[in-house]
């Protein structure tokens, strides 16, 4: 806490400007009116306040807005956002995507902090669903964002938002998450032609059922081994040797290198040796 002391004569701030960086902590506390600070928040980030001085500015805003800051203040917090606790952020009502972007920019280059997670949670809950623009923004800052959501949370993602998802956004998703996302992707991309459809759906295939894999095997898609290895084991097991050969195309030779790993290992054990021999890869069932 900063002690309450009278502002020295002639030091009362008439506006938020760079002269304030030369004020000591107690002078900032005594000479800067909280209401003035709130109305001129857009200037704060353009002034190189010390980290120490930011503590005073936060204290002033906390006193002025004990129930939580208004969005007009939040959108201009800049580096002050780093001083906020999750408890502070839970009091906010953030509705503007521009505000969200401005605050995420301050955290750029870092893992998602508890503050950012709370901010995103408040924002998404306020919107009711993860719309395309929000998802675009969040995955741009945090490629792993989608995979940090529970299957229940992912169920609120509308299929139209799936267009914003890039392959790298799904790198850390587990099968349960892909189970939720795959049907949405299938719906989102349903009007695309064969080869274009496969390019888009490929990174979601970890959630695909057997019948969809069988259908893909009829379309000369040439699935790479990396994608095949991410398929659900229970979806791969019922596929015949001929279907896997068609699914992988020229990549079928890669099965040999993966014969000890799931799902290839389990699939091999389900096949007749005669059928495996037709591949000419020396796979032993």
């Amino acid at each position: 806490e900063v002690e309450k002391t009278a502002c020295p004569s002639g030091k009362k701030a008439r506006e938020i400007d760079e002269s304030l960086i030369f004020y000591k902590k107690w002078e900032l506390e005594a000479c800067v009116d909280a209401a003035l600070l709130a109305t001129q928040m857009d200037r704060v980030n353009a002034i190189p306040f010390t980290y120490e001085q930011l503590d005073v500015l936060k204290h002033k805003l906390d006193e002025l807005y004990p129930q939580g800051y208004p969005e007009s203040v939040i959108q201009h917090l800049g580096y002050l956002f780093l001083k906020m606790s999750p408890e502070d952020i839970r009091k906010w009502n953030v509705t503007s995507l521009e505000t969200l972007k401005a605050l995420l920019e301050v955290n750029k280059g870092h893992e998602m902090s508890p503050q950012v997670a709370t901010l995103i949670d408040r924002f998404v809950k306020g919107r009711g669903q993860l719309d395309k623009d929000t998802l675009d923004t969040l995955t741009a800052f945090y490629p792993g964002y989608l995979c940090s959501l529970s299957p229940e949370e992912l169920s609120s993602v509308p299929p139209s938002s799936i267009w914003a998802v890039r392959p790298q956004d799904l790198d850390t998703c587990d099968p349960r998450q892909l189970d939720v996302l795959y049907p949405k992707a299938r719906l989102a991309f349903q009007n695309m032609n064969g080869s274009e459809y496969f390019v888009k759906i490929q990174s979601f295939l970890g959630g695909a059922p057997t019948e969809d894999l069988k259908a893909l095997s009829q379309q000369n898609v040439s699935m790479d081994l990396a994608t095949f290895m991410k398929l659900r084991t229970d979806a791969v097991l019922p596929l015949t040797v001929a279907e896997v050969q068609k699914l992988l195309g020229p990549h079928v030779e890669g099965l040999k290198a993966e014969e000890r790993h799931r799902p290839v290992r389990d699939w091999i054990l389900r096949q007749r040796q005669d059928d495996l021999d037709t591949l000419g890869l020396g796979l032993q069932g």
Epitope: E18, I47, P48, T50, Y51, E52, D55, Y79, G109
Partner: antibody, heavy 116, light 107 residues
Framework: EVQLVESGGGLVQPGGSLRLSCAAS????????IHWVRQAPGKGLEWVAS????????TYADSVKGRFTISADTSKNTAYLQMNSLRAEDTAVYYC?????????WGQGTLVTVSS | DIQMTQSPSSLSASVGDRVTITCRAS??????VAWYQQKPGKAPKLLID???RLYSGVPSRFSGSGSGTDFTLTISSLQPEDFATYYC?????????FGQGTKVEIK
């Protein structure tokens, strides 16, 4: 891609002057604070000066105050360190770095040797 | 000025070891501390800021903690590429100051 490239270092006699440049790419220096940090041979890091280009606010270490001047040319996206009245103890590798508080990107450094 | 005192000034460790470096500020700096790694002939690289925030691309074996005056950088399992000098920096108040460095050498 963010890059900072220093230049202008070299050998100078005590009492002499040098101007170091720090050319930035991948971001605009008006958006970020630029710092100069030096490292004497075999020693640790020492903050020298900072400039916040939007407002032109500058700040200096006591050891260089009155002798060194930090500036920026926003049209060239370049920061400078004008070093006057150089002393033997100013011998160091000079790095420019960016960031309001912590420094997330650094240049490769330029060596300044002050010797007669 | 705020003094940052690092300890130890050097240490010898083996690959796989857990390494802890401490930094003490001469006055309260809240969480206004960053950690850097520097290899010979190279510029420092940011590892951690705000005492504990891992910078992107930095392996998760690095972690930071502390608040007030006492701060710690921990490497949970030392890797060959981690042999370097580590510096703490306080940016809570001007002038920003660095610790004197801790050199991590191969045992």
């Amino acid at each position: 891609e963010v890059q900072l490239v220093e230049s202008g270092g070299g050998l100078v006699q005590p009492g002499g002057s040098l101007r170091l440049s720090c050319a930035a790419s991948g971001f605009t220096i008006t958006d970020r604070t630029i710092h100069w940090v030096r490292q004497a041979p075999g020693k640790g890091l020492e903050w020298v000066a900072s400039i916040f280009p939007t407002k032109g606010v500058t700040t200096y270490a006591d050891s260089v105050k009155g002798r060194f001047t930090i500036s920026a040319d926003t049209s060239k996206n370049t920061a400078y360190l004008q070093m006057n009245s150089l002393r033997a103890e100013d011998t160091a590798v000079y790095y420019c770095a960016r960031g309001r508080y912590w420094m997330d990107y650094w240049g490769q450094g330029t060596l300044v040797t002050v010797s007669s | 000025d705020i003094q940052m005192t690092q300890s130890p000034s050097s240490l010898s460790a083996s690959v796989g070891d857990r390494v802890t470096i401490t930094c003490r500020a001469s006055q309260d700096v809240k969480e206004g501390v960053a950690w850097y790694q520097q290899k010979p002939g190279k510029a420092p690289k940011l590892l951690i800021d705000q005492s504990h925030r891992l910078y992107s691309g930095v392996p998760s074996r690095f972690s930071g903690s502390g608040s007030g005056t006492d701060f710690t950088l921990t490497i949970s399992s030392l890797q060959p590429e981690d042999f370097a000098t580590y510096y703490c920096q306080q940016y809570y108040a001007w002038p920003s100051t660095f610790g004197q460095g801790t050199k991590v050498e191969i045992k």
